[in-house]
Interface confidence: medium
C-alpha cells in the first residue's frame, strides 16, 4: 500500500515533464480541488502494476500470518504475567498491538494489489488510517522505549517506575493520539477510486499535490527520522555509560534493544530513501520521467515490503535474542498444556520469574 494541485493553469504531458510535473501524473487528483483542465495523462504503469500483482499478495499474505502469530505470542507472553508490567514491557505490548493491527490490514492491500479494491470507500479510509496509525505507533513506541532506557540508565531516573503506573499509560495514549492525528488525512482523503484506464477500483488519496508532499514529509520525519534520531541518541549515551561502568551484564542485557533498533533502521531506511526520492521529484529537485517513476514505484513496493517485515521481526528477535522471552513462552505453552513439551521442564527457570523479560530491577535489559 503505497500510499493533487490547486487552481493551476493547464499543463499537458510535454509541459509537465519540462516543468518537473507540477501535476504529478501517477497519483490521484481531487476533481474539486482544482479548477484547471486537461493535464498530462499518467505514465504507463504496466511494469510496476504487474510487479505489484505478482509480488505484493504473496508477501502480504506471508507477513500477515507471521505477524499475527509472532505478535500474538508477544502479547500472550506479556499478558500472562501475574505482576504489573514494567514500563518497557508496556511499550512492547503496545508495539505488539500496533504491529498486529498493521498486519491485519495487509490482506486488504493484498487484494487491492492482486485484483482491485472491493471493500468500498469506508473500509478504504479505515484500513488506510489503521495502517498509518500503526506505522507511526511502531516507530514512536520504539523511540519511547529508548527514551525510557536512556532516563533509567544514563540519568538513573526511573520515570515510569517511581511515578504512578498511569504515567506509562498516558505516554502510550499520547502516542496513539498523535498517531490518530497523523492519520486524519487518511480518514478525510482516502477513497475507493475507479481508475478508468486500468478499469479497476483502488484505494487512493484524493487531494492536492502540496498536501501529498506534506504528508510524505511528515511520514519521513515523524515516522522515521525523529524516532531514529531519538533511538540513536539514547542508545549512544546508554552504551557510553555502560562501557565506562564496565557493566558487562548490563551490556549483554542491552543486546536485545540494540538489535531491535538496528532492525528498525535496516527495515525502514530503504523505504524512506525511496520516499525521499519521490519527495524530491514532487518538489522538482529531481526531474520526473516515466522511466524513473516506474523504477520508484517498484522500489517503493519492494522497500515497503521490507518495512512491513519489521512488524514480524520484533517477535523473532525477542525469541532468538531474549532468553527470558523464550522461557516465558515455554512456560505459557506448558500452562496451556501443549503436548510434547516435557523437555521444557529441564529449562532453567528465571531467578526473577516475575520481573520483566525485557528489563531488570537494575533498569536495564535482561534480554539474555
Amino acid at each position: 500500500m503505497v500510499l493533487e494541485v490547486s487552481d493551476h493553469q493547464v499543463l499537458n504531458d510535454a509541459e509537465v515533464a519540462a516543468l518537473l510535473e507540477n501535476f504529478s501524473s501517477s497519483y490521484d487528483y481531487g476533481e474539486n480541488e482544482s479548477d484547471s483542465c486537461c493535464t498530462s495523462p499518467p505514465c504507463p504503469q504496466d511494469f510496476s502494476l504487474n510487479f505489484d500483482r505478482a509480488f505484493l499478495p504473496a508477501l502480504y499474505s506471508l507477513l500477515f500470518l507471521l505477524g499475527l502469530l509472532g505478535n500474538g505470542a508477544v502479547a500472550a507472553v506479556l499478558l500472562s504475567r501475574r505482576t504489573a508490567l514494567s514500563s518497557t514491557d508496556t511499550f512492547l505490548l503496545h508495539l505488539a498491538v500496533a504491529d498486529t493491527l498493521l498486519v491485519l490490514t495487509l490482506p486488504l492491500w493484498a487484494v487491492d494489489a492482486a485484483v482491485q479494491w472491493v471493500f468500498g470507500s469506508g473500509l478504504c479510509k479505515v484500513a488506510g488510517a489503521l495502517f498509518n496509525i500503526n506505522f507511526y505507533a511502531g516507530a514512536l513506541l520504539l523511540a519511547c522505549i529508548s527514551f525510557d532506557r536512556y532516563l533509567n540508565i544514563v540519568h538513573a531516573t526511573q520515570l515510569y517506575r517511581r511515578g504512578p503506573p498511569a504515567r506509562v499509560t498516558l505516554t502510550c495514549l499520547a502516542v496513539w493520539g498523535l498517531c490518530l492525528l497523523f492519520a486524519l488525512p487518511d480518514f478525510i482523503f482516502l477513497s475507493a477510486h475507479h481508475d478508468e484506464r486500468l478499469n479497476a477500483t483502488h484505494c487512493q488519496y484524493n487531494f492536492p499535490q502540496v498536501g501529498r508532499t506534506a504528508l510524505r514529509v511528515l511520514q519521513l520525519v515523524a515516522g522515521f527520522l525523529l524516532p531514529l534520531l531519538v533511538m540513536a541518541y539514547c542508545y549512544a549515551h546508554i552504551l557510553a555509560v555502560l562501557l565506562v561502568s564496565r557493566g558487562q551484564r548490563r551490556l549483554r542485557a542491552m543486546r536485545l534493544v540494540v538489535v531491535v533498533v538496528v532492525a528498525f533502521a535496516l527495515c525502514w531506511t530503504p523505504y524512506h530513501l525511496v520516499v525521499l526520492v519521490d519527495i524530491l521529484m514532487d518538489l522538482g529537485a529531481l526531474a520526473r520521467n516515466c522511466g524513473r517513476e516506474s523504477r520508484v514505484d517498484v522500489a517503493k513496493s519492494v522497500t515497503s515490503g521490507l518495512g512491513y517485515m519489521h512488524c514480524c521481526l520484533n517477535p523473532l528477535l525477542y525469541a532468538f535474542v531474549g532468553v527470558k522471552f523464550r522461557e516465558r513462552m515455554w512456560m505459557l505453552l506448558l500452562r496451556l498444556g501443549c503436548p510434547n513439551q516435557r523437555g521444557l521442564q529441564r529449562q532453567p527457570s528465571s531467578s526473577r520469574r516475575d520481573s520483566s523479560w525485557s528489563e531488570t530491577s537494575e533498569a536495564s535489559y535482561s534480554g539474555l
Partner: antibody, heavy 123, light 106 residues
Framework: EVQLLESGGGLVQPGGSLRLSCAAS????????MSWVRQAPGKGLEWVAT????????YYPDSVKGRFTISRDNAKNTLYLQMNSLRAEDTAVYYC????????????????WGQGTLVTVSS | DIQLTQSPSFLSASVGDRVTITCRAS?????LYWYQQKPGKAPKLWIY???TLASGVPSRFSGSGSGNEYTLTISSLQPEDFATYYC?????????FGQGTKLEIK
C-alpha cells in the same frame, strides 16, 4: 444518458458575431471541463476552446484567441461559445464535447460529443 | 505545434481484411487517442491512452505505439467499421488531430 445539444448556428457575414449554446444533460455538468471542436466541410477536426469545470480557466488555440470566448452557466447546465470577428475560414460544424476525468483530473481528449451546429461565414 | 500525420488518408478494404492505420507525430507524444466518425454524425471516442478501447468498441480493434508512431489495427474488418478515423494528441497544446483516414469498402 449523456446528452449534448448544440444550437445557435447559422449564416453570418464576415466580421460578424454569433453565440453558440450547448445544453448538457445526463451527467453532473459542474464536474466536467468542456470544449468546442469544429470541423470545416470535408475537412478534419480542430480544437477551438476549452473551459475548466468551474469556469475559472479558459484555453484557446492561436487561430481563435482574442476572437472567441468560451463560457459556461453551471446553474443552467449550458456551455457557450461567443464568436466575434468571424472569418470565412471559421465556417464549420461546431461540436460541443466533454472532457473525461481520469483519477479526478481532466483529460485533453473527448468522451462525449454533441451532434454539432453548422456555422457558415459568407457574404 | 505537434503535427499528426495519418497514413493512408484513404484506404479501400474488404470485409474480413486486417487493416492498419498509422499516425505519426512530428515530435514524441505520451499517448494517442482515436475517434471514429461516420458521415453526418459526431465523432465517437474509439481508443484512449493509446490502447484502451472505449466502451462498446469491439475487441477486433486494437491500438499500439509509442513516441512518434502509433497504430490502430482492425483484425477483421466488418461492414460497420467503414468510417473515418482520427488520431489526437494532448501532449502539447494546442491539442491537435490527424487529418483523418477514410476507410472505404473495396
Amino acid at each position: 444518458e449523456v446528452q449534448l445539444l448544440e444550437s445557435g448556428g447559422g449564416l453570418v457575414q464576415p466580421g460578424g458575431s454569433l453565440r453558440l449554446s450547448c445544453a448538457a444533460s445526463g451527467f453532473t455538468f459542474t464536474s466536467y471541463a468542456m470544449s468546442w471542436v469544429r470541423q470545416a466541410p470535408g475537412k478534419g477536426l480542430e480544437w477551438v476552446a476549452t473551459i475548466s469545470h468551474g469556469g475559472t480557466y479558459t484555453y484557446y488555440p492561436d487561430s481563435v484567441k482574442g476572437r472567441f470566448t468560451i463560457s459556461r452557466d453551471n446553474a443552467k447546465n449550458t456551455l457557450y461559445l461567443q464568436m466575434n470577428s468571424l472569418r470565412a475560414e471559421d465556417t464549420a460544424v461546431y461540436y460541443c464535447a466533454r472532457h473525461p476525468i481520469y483519477s479526478g483530473n481532466y483529460q485533453g481528449y473527448f468522451d462525449y460529443w454533441g451532434q454539432g451546429t453548422l456555422v457558415t461565414v459568407s457574404s | 505545434d505537434i503535427q499528426l500525420t495519418q497514413s493512408p488518408s484513404f484506404l479501400s478494404a474488404s470485409v474480413g481484411d486486417r487493416v492498419t492505420i498509422t499516425c505519426r507525430a512530428s515530435s514524441g507524444v505520451n499517448y494517442l487517442y482515436w475517434y471514429q466518425q461516420k458521415p453526418g454524425k459526431a465523432p465517437k471516442l474509439w481508443i484512449y491512452f493509446t490502447s484502451t478501447l472505449a466502451s462498446g468498441v469491439p475487441s477486433r480493434f486494437s491500438g499500439s505505439g509509442s513516441g512518434n508512431e502509433y497504430t490502430l489495427t482492425i483484425s477483421s474488418l466488418q461492414p460497420e467499421d467503414f468510417a473515418t478515423y482520427y488520431c489526437q494528441q494532448f501532449t502539447s497544446s494546442p491539442y491537435t488531430f490527424g487529418q483523418g483516414t477514410k476507410l472505404e469498402i473495396k
